[in-house]
Structures are given as structure tokens and as C-alpha cells.
């Protein structure tokens, strides 16, 4: 019988005994930042070799008792949960041990800074594969930890951290918050997030994606063939780490943007309880279980896109929320979203040589959040056309005007506080699929690409009567670059991308007392790339 | 040799306060510093804690990822430290756990 | 280069007890424990248990009955097996190999006991 | 403990034949199999782990295949150094057991 995490992260209509072969990984690298490990247990034995990098505090206490096998059970546990010979994701990966926590389980944010060192060093010395670097640790936010962590994954290494255990905001805690680390909470076998006692798992903006992480059978360091159930959300990043060993084996190559997107876009979507998570976290929270690719080549034909929600902005009048792409993926396209529906749009403005999305706050909001859509679009040249307020009663337009430039996202951005109602019809003239239509007090900006092979469509959804939420889908295929609403009026609290589908948000109707001429229409901006398919199709 | 002028050093601590570990300190270069000025820095460091009576312990000098260093030291000394050349930024050691 | 050395041949007599020792070189003993397998003259191959380097915790194969017992020294890379009381058909090449998965084996020590 | 059944104990071939051993268990241990050669006189040798997976070094004519409770070990062609005996060995439960051997000789 097979466990039912390995189970969980097999893909539909595969067998996970059949899918996970003795191989798997086997080109890869995973260092381990733990505890000390059992590394002869038969589980993992002659798969992780224990370096000799030792860095912990002293152990709290002047009664404690250092009893070898819990010394090493989390490590043990974990390195069995990436390539153990029987309950492993990626059986074939070979593992590298460091010593950064004690037989406490705790350790120092200095130590752990110098084992990454370590790594660092060692791969200077000794290049060899793909990396993956497991941190199943967690600490208060630290500047220095993120940035080494920053330093480490711009030099080309994977790494994957606990989202952290105290049923709290991610961003509150590190690695979990170093935007350059994939980041991971803990689900069940229900796919509901993981209560650990009065806690929990992590969630939250910096969350990537949740994996298995309660009652995950491993290596046990009570006895060299015992096994034991462990839960939190170092099991879970544990999962992530053997898959992306799996991903990288079979697609060596692989950038950290593109393993990231992989990840993402593999994974079940929409399963996970949302009411678990506070109530302003949900929106935050990916809802995401990370899985194996249904066959370990052939993704590489499509366009991927994932949201990136920024920090919130504070209630602050002239409060502004940035939310920023990985390095090599382009801004596709930037929305906004604030709970009171205060906010005076958004936009997409050059920032260090690249774009970002800026949201802005109005007079007597909360806060808003900028909500960029990164996509992985080779070869492409991006740029942003803007077009002032028309104080016209057509409202603003602005179109790519460039000869093969395409549309992939609409922002709009207004300086007066409160924008009326436009009660002109605000669907675009057919026919014009290259252009952003807005209210006429808002400047609107369009993001037009030229990719080789990139085509794109505008896809809208309308609701006479006020409502909610109005959601729009692109087709199997076709890629979600751009979400934004039609108009920009108050009541609209915002657009966001979730997967593949743009859901606009409204105020409750039943406390704004809206009239039926504020409809309100969902634009979504649906692409793809012929250039990729093409070349997929080639390469097989 | 002073901080570049309008660049303030900055010091950084866990908002979680039974996590701290105070008395030990990451202090953070500027990306460009070479070792031998991490090395300089830390000795200077300690040169002028000395002539103030404090005793200070360089336990590693950080390269490859991070240029800096981390010391040993009082906490009486942040002030001092975080006028000294290429520092970027300062942060109270802390501790981390198994998730 | 990965080896196990193991020693010379012994002549026991039945009562009697021995020690084979088994030298690991070439690879990082913590990594692996070191399996026991036994072979009688003309018979297949019988395991016999497993002994950690890294802390000495040993699994056995039921039928030793607690008369083998398996020791590490890491201080000098050394896997020993004992066993007392010996019988006749205790006759055998004793191998030692490299971890559960016998992937590098020892030259094998003959323990031969007759009265 | 898993019984291990090998097939044929003994068979007589030429140099270049094709040669196949097969090893049964007597309950299912998924692929884990290993087979080993061994020599008048020597230990034996790892020669396929996983019930498929050549360790380096081990020449490509060794191949290994199967499943749950059915596994073949098969010499492509035969070369004077094969002459010898061939144990498989589950690797599944503790204790791992060996088949009874199978005895390649020249014919």
C-alpha cells in the first residue's frame, strides 16, 4: 500500500509505485540544513552523505539528556521524505547533510548563514548538477538570512523552505519570506491545512504552494529499519524538494523562474479549505498542492504565469503597494485590490531597469495590494503605452500601436479620489482587440509584448446587475496574462488573477445600494505562444 | 575612512523577542567589499572597542555569499559598529527551529 | 578505492567462540552499516545482520539466537562479528559487506570447527 | 521471512548465447530485487539492484527486469568471464534472503 502522500503528489491516471522510479532524481543534488541524520539508516543509506559542516547553539537547559536517535530524528525524517529508498518522492536523488540545528531542534540564523556559505563554496569547488537546497527551518524575519538566501538562488541553486508551524502570516518569518525561495505549507489528506496543536501551517502572500505535511511516513532514527509519521512544514517542503530533484533530473536546465512556474502549474488547484486560513489571508493564500508533471518532459510548449500579490500598502493617503517579478519573468500585466474598494488604481512603471506594478491608495482607505501577473515568455520586448484621462464621455482608450506588439494586460490609475459612475457603455468596439478601454477620469495602461509566435485574445464577462465577484476563464491552451475590470468605478474593490481565471471583485450590494447601471465586467486577456508549441513539437 | 555620505548604516532584530540572541551580530558589508576589507573591518572593529575597554570575538568572516562578518560583542558597541567603513547593515544573531 | 578487508581464516573447535573483523576503507563509514553474510561449503548465502558505524545499533537475523553478537570501532574503521558457542555447521565463509544494500563485499574469512 | 525460488539451479550454454535466469518471491517485493555473480572461490558481486539498475562498471549484456513477484536476470551474450553462479536476493523485508543460486557452466 502506498502512503498517502506519495499518493497525493502522483498525477491522475498514474500508479505512484509505477511513477516513482528508483532513478528519479538521479542527476540532482539536495542539501539537507537540519539536524544531525542517521544517514546509514536503510531508508536512505548510501543516498545522503553527511558533510562534515557543524554549526548549533548549545542545547537549552542543564538536565537535558542528548539521546543520539532524537538528535537525528527531523533530519533523518526528512531525508527520507525526499529519497528514501521506499517512502521517498525522488528515490535517485543524492543528499548532502549539514548540521544547523541541535537535538533541540533549534539553531541560529549566523549558523545558518554559514552553512549556506558552505554550499555556496562547495559548488565553486566542485560544480556539478542541478541543486536543491531543503531549509525545513524557520526564524523570525531576518534581512540577512533572506538576502543570503537572495545571493544563493541568483547563483543558479533551488532552494525550498517550511513555510514555518505558527499559524501565522509567512512574511513574519525567514527563509519564508525571501521572495527568491519556493515556500511551502502543509496539507492533509483531506487537502485542508495542517492544525499542529493550538498551530499550525504557515499561509499567506509568501506562501508559494502547500504540499503534504501530516502523518507522512518516513525514516525513523529509533532503529535502522524503523519508520515513523511525522507532520509539519518541513515534510511538506520536503515533498516540493524531491519533486523539483525530479523535474531538475529530467529537465536539467531548468531556471529557478521555470521550476517555480512548473511547480506551480502542476499543481491541484482549488482543493484546499480556504476557511481555515483568516479571512483576510484567503485571497493572500495560493491554493495550491504541489504534484509530480504528469510526464517528466513536454512542458515546455507553454506559457506560464503565476500571481505575485505585493506587502499591503497601510492606510496611508499617498500609500502606494509594489509587487515585482522573479528577474527573468516579465510583468505581464498589474491589477489592484483593496478591501474598502479605496484605492486609485494602478500602474505599471520602470523600476531598475524593470517593470513593476504600483498600486495606490485613496484618501480614507485601508490599504491596497498591487497583484502582478509574472509570465515566462522568452525573447519577449515589453513595453507600456499610456493614455491621459480623455474626459470624454467614451472614456479612456489606449491601444498597441507597435507593428506586432500584442495586448497582455490593462491597468488604469486615477489621481481624483472617487470616480464617478460611467454610464456609457464600456465594452470595446469589437474588432479592437488591442486596446484598453477605461473610465474618463483614469489614465490606462496597456502592456503590449512582441514575442516571437505570441498571440492574444480579449475574453469578457458582464453582469448587468451588481454582483460580488464576476469571474472570467481562459480556455484550455490559452494562458491568463491580464485581469482588470470594466469600469473602474468605486464599488469595484479590485482584479486578480487566481490559475487561469480573472475575478473581479465588487463592494456587497446589499450595503452599497448600487443601482443596475453599475454593471460590472470582468476583462480577461487570454494568450499564447506559437513559438513554443512549435518548438516542443519539434523537439519530440 | 567614514560611510559614504547619506548612506546610514542600519540596524536590524527579531520582532520575536524570546527568539533574540543579543551580544551576537551578523554586520553586513556593501556587495563590492572584497575579503581583505571584511578582514580590515572586523579588526578595526575591534581595535577601537579595545581603546573603550570592550572585548570583542570575530567568529567568522563571511565571503562567497555575503561580505561581513559576525562578532561577539556588547551591544554598547552597535553605534560604534555601524559607523565603520562598507558597513551596508547590522543584525542581532536569533534563533531558528526545526518546522 | 572502496574496499573491505577482512581477516585471515580460523579453526575453532565446537564450544568455542570467534571474532572476524572487517576493515572499511575508501568511502565515509557513517554512511553505511556493514551486513554479515554467511556461506556454507557448497550452499547458498545466508545474512546474517547488519551493525551501525555511526552508533552501533545492530539488527539480527533471528536464527543467531544470541550467539553472534556485532561490534563497530569507527576510531579505526573496524566491523567485528562474534559468535560463540560454536557448532559444526557454523562451517562457512563469512562475508562482510557494505550496508543493507551488500553493494562492496569483504574477501570473505573461513571459520572452519571441528573437534 | 520471503522464500526465494531461482530457475533453472544449473544450466549448461555456449560463449554468445542468450541467457535468461528467473527468480520468483513468495510474496510481493515490488522491484526490489537484486542479483549477484559470484566465482569459484570469490565474494560475490552487486550486479543489478532495484531489479533493473546496473551498478557502474557492470557490463551492458547484464540486464534485469520484472516486478511484484516475477524477475529475470539475462546475459545478452554470453562472454567466458560469466561462467558462474547467479543469486538473487529480495531486498524488500528485513531479512533480505537469497535464491538458491542458478549455476551457468560451459557446455
Known amino acids: 500500500s502506498i502512503p498517502w502522500n506519495l499518493e497525493r503528489i502522483t498525477p491522475p491516471r498514474y500508479r505512484a509505485d509505477e511513477y516513482q522510479p528508483p532513478d528519479g532524481g538521479s542527476l540532482v543534488e539536495v542539501y539537507l540544513l537540519d539536524t544531525s541524520i542517521q544517514s546509514d539508516h536503510r531508508e536512505i543509506e548510501g543516498r545522503v552523505m553527511v558533510t562534515d559542516f557543524e554549526n548549533v547553539p548549545e542545547e537549552d537547559g542543564t538536565r537535558f539528556h542528548r539521546q543520539a536517535s532524537k538528535c537525528d530524528s527531523h533530519g533523518t525524517h526528512l531525508a527520507g521524505v525526499v529519497s528514501g529508498r521506499d517512502a521517498g518522492v525522488a528515490k535517485g536523488a543524492s543528499m548532502r547533510s549539514l548540521r544547523v540545528l541541535n537535538c533541540q531542534g533549534k539553531g541560529t540564523v549566523s549558523g545558518t548563514l554559514i552553512g549556506l556559505e558552505f554550499i555556496r563554496k562547495s559548488q565553486l569547488v566542485q560544480p556539478v548538477g542541478p541543486l536543491v537546497v531543503l531549509l525545513p527551518l524557520a526564524g523570525g524575519y531576518s534581512r540577512v538570512l533572506n538576502a543570503a538566501c537572495q545571493r544563493l538562488a541568483r547563483a543558479g541553486v533551488v532552494l525550498v523552505t517550511a513555510a514555518g508551524n505558527f499559524r501565522d502570516d509567512a512574511c513574519l518569518y525567514s527563509p519564508a519570506s525571501a521572495p527568491e525561495v519556493i515556500t511551502v505549507g502543509a496539507t492533509n489528506a483531506q487537502d485542508q491545512p495542517v492544525t499542529l496543536g493550538t498551530l499550525g501551517t504557515n499561509f499567506g502572500r509568501c506562501v508559494d504552494l502547500f504540499a503534504p505535511g501530516e502523518d507522512i511516513i518516513g525514516a525513523s532514527s529509533d532503529c535502522s529499519t524503523c519508520f515513523v509519521s511525522q507532520s509539519g512544514t518541513s515534510q511538506a517542503a520536503a515533498h516540493v524538494a524531491g519533486i523539483a530533484a525530479m523535474m531538475l533530473s529530467a529537465e536539467p536546465e531548468l531556471t529557478l523562474a521555470e521550476l517555480r512556474q512548473r511547480l506551480i502549474h502542476f499543481s491541484a488547484k482549488d482543493v484546499i479549505n480556504e476557511a481555515w486560513f483568516p479571512e483576510d489571508q484567503r485571497v493572500l493564500t495560493p491554493n495550491l498542492v504541489a504534484a509530480l508533471p504528469p510526464s517528466t518532459h513536454g512542458a515546455g510548449w507553454q506559457l506560464f504565469c503565476r500571481t505575485v500579490w505585493s506587502a499591503h500598502s497601510g492606510p496611508t493617503r499617498m500609500a502606494t503597494a509594489i509587487a515585482r517579478c522573479a528577474p527573468d519573468e516579465e510583468l505581464l500585466s498589474c491589477s489592484s485590490f483593496s478591501r474598502s474598494g479605496k484605492r486609485r488604481g494602478e500602474r505599471m512603471e520602470a523600476q531598475g531597469g524593470k517593470l513593476v506594478c504600483r498600486a495606490h491608495n485613496a484618501f480614507g482607505g485601508e490599504g491596497v495590494y498591487a497583484i502582478a501577473r509574472c509570465c515566462l515568455l522568452p525573447q519577449a520586448n515589453c513595453s507600456v503605452h499610456t493614455a491621459p484621462p480623455a474626459e470624454a464621455s467614451m472614456g479612456t482608450r489606449v491601444h498597441c500601436h507597435q507593428q506586432g506588439h500584442v495586448l497582455t494586460g490593462c491597468s488604469s490609475h486615477w489621481e481624483v479620489e472617487d470616480l464617478g459612475t460611467h454610464k456609457p457603455p464600456v465594452l470595446r468596439p469589437r474588432g479592437q482587440p488591442n486596446q484598453c478601454v477605461g473610465h474618463r477620469e483614469a489614465s490606462i495602461h496597456a502592456s503590449c509584448c512582441h514575442a516571437p509566435g505570441l498571440e492574444c485574445k480579449v475574453k469578457e464577462h458582464g453582469i448587468p446587475a451588481p454582483q460580488e465577484q464576476v469571474t472570467v476563464a481562459c480556455e484550455e491552451g490559452w494562458t491568463l496574462t491580464g485581469c482588470s475590470a470594466l469600469p473602474g468605478t468605486s464599488h469595484v474593490l479590485g482584479a486578480y488573477a487566481v490559475d487561469n481565471t480573472c475575478v473581479v471583485r465588487s463592494r456587497d450590494v446589499s450595503t452599497t445600494g448600487s443601482t443596475s447601471e453599475e454593471a460590472v465586467t470582468a476583462v480577461a486577456i487570454c494568450c499564447r505562444s506559437r513559438h513554443l508549441a512549435q518548438a516542443s513539437q519539434e523537439l519530440q | 575612512e567614514a560611510p559614504e555620505h547619506g548612506t546610514t548604516a542600519t540596524f536590524h532584530r527579531c520582532a520575536k523577542d524570546p527568539w533574540r540572541l543579543p551580544g551576537t551580530y551578523v554586520v553586513v558589508l556593501k556587495e563590492e567589499t572584497h575579503l581583505s576589507q571584511s578582514e580590515r573591518t572586523a579588526r578595526r572593529l575591534q581595535a577601537q572597542a579595545a581603546r573603550r575597554g570592550y572585548l570583542t570575538k570575530i567568529l567568522h568572516v563571511f565571503h562567497g555569499l555575503l561580505p561581513g562578518f559576525l562578532v561577539k560583542m556588547s551591544g554598547d558597541l552597535l553605534e560604534l559598529a555601524l559607523k565603520l567603513p562598507h558597513v551596508d547593515y547590522i543584525e542581532e544573531d536569533s534563533s531558528v527551529f526545526a518546522q | 578505492q572502496v574496499q573491505l578487508v577482512q581477516s585471515g581464516a580460523e579453526v575453532k573447535k565446537p564450544g568455542a567462540s570467534v571474532k572476524v573483523s572487517c576493515k572499511a576503507s575508501?568511502?565515509?563509514?557513517?554512511?553505511?552499516?556493514i551486513s554479515w553474510v554467511r556461506q556454507a561449503p557448497g550452499q547458498g548465502l545466508e545474512w546474517m545482520g547488519w551493525?551501525?558505524?555511526?552508533?552501533?545499533?545492530?539488527n539480527y537475523a533471528q536464527k543467531l539466537q544470541g550467539r553472534g553478537t556485532m561490534t563497530t570501532d569507527p576510531s579505526t574503521s573496524t566491523a567485528y562479528m562474534e559468535l560463540r558457542s560454536l557448532r559444526s555447521d557454523d562451517t562457512a565463509v563469512y562475508y562482510c559487506?557494505?550496508?543493507?544494500?551488500?553493494?562492496?563485499w569483504g574477501q570473505g574469512t573461513t571459520v572452519t570447527v571441528s573437534s | 521471512d520471503i522464500q526465494m525460488t531461482q530457475s533453472p539451479s544449473s544450466l549448461s550454454a555456449s560463449v554468445g548465447d542468450r541467457v535468461t535466469i528467473t527468480c520468483r518471491a513468495s510474496?510481493?517485493?515490488?522491484?526490489?530485487l537484486d542479483w549477484y555473480q559470484q566465482k569459484p572461490g570469490k565474494a560475490p558481486k552487486l550486479l543489478i539492484y532495484a531489479a533493473s539498475t546496473r551498478p557502474s562498471g557492470v557490463p551492458s549484456r547484464f540486464s534485469g527486469s520484472g516486478s511484484g513477484t516475477d524477475f529475470t536476470l539475462t546475459i545478452s551474450s554470453l562472454q567466458p568471464e560469466d561462467f558462474a553462479t547467479y543469486y538473487c536476493q529480495q531486498d524488500q523485508d528485513i531479512p533480505p534472503t537469497f535464491g538458491q543460486g542458478t549455476k551457468v557452466e560451459i557446455k
Open positions: 510474496q510481493s517485493i515490488n522491484n526490489w
Open positions: 575508501g568511502y565515509a563509514i557513517y554512511n553505511y552499516g
Open positions: 551493525v551501525s558505524f555511526y552508533n552501533g545499533n545492530t
Open positions: 559487506a557494505r550496508g543493507y544494500v551488500m553493494d562492496i
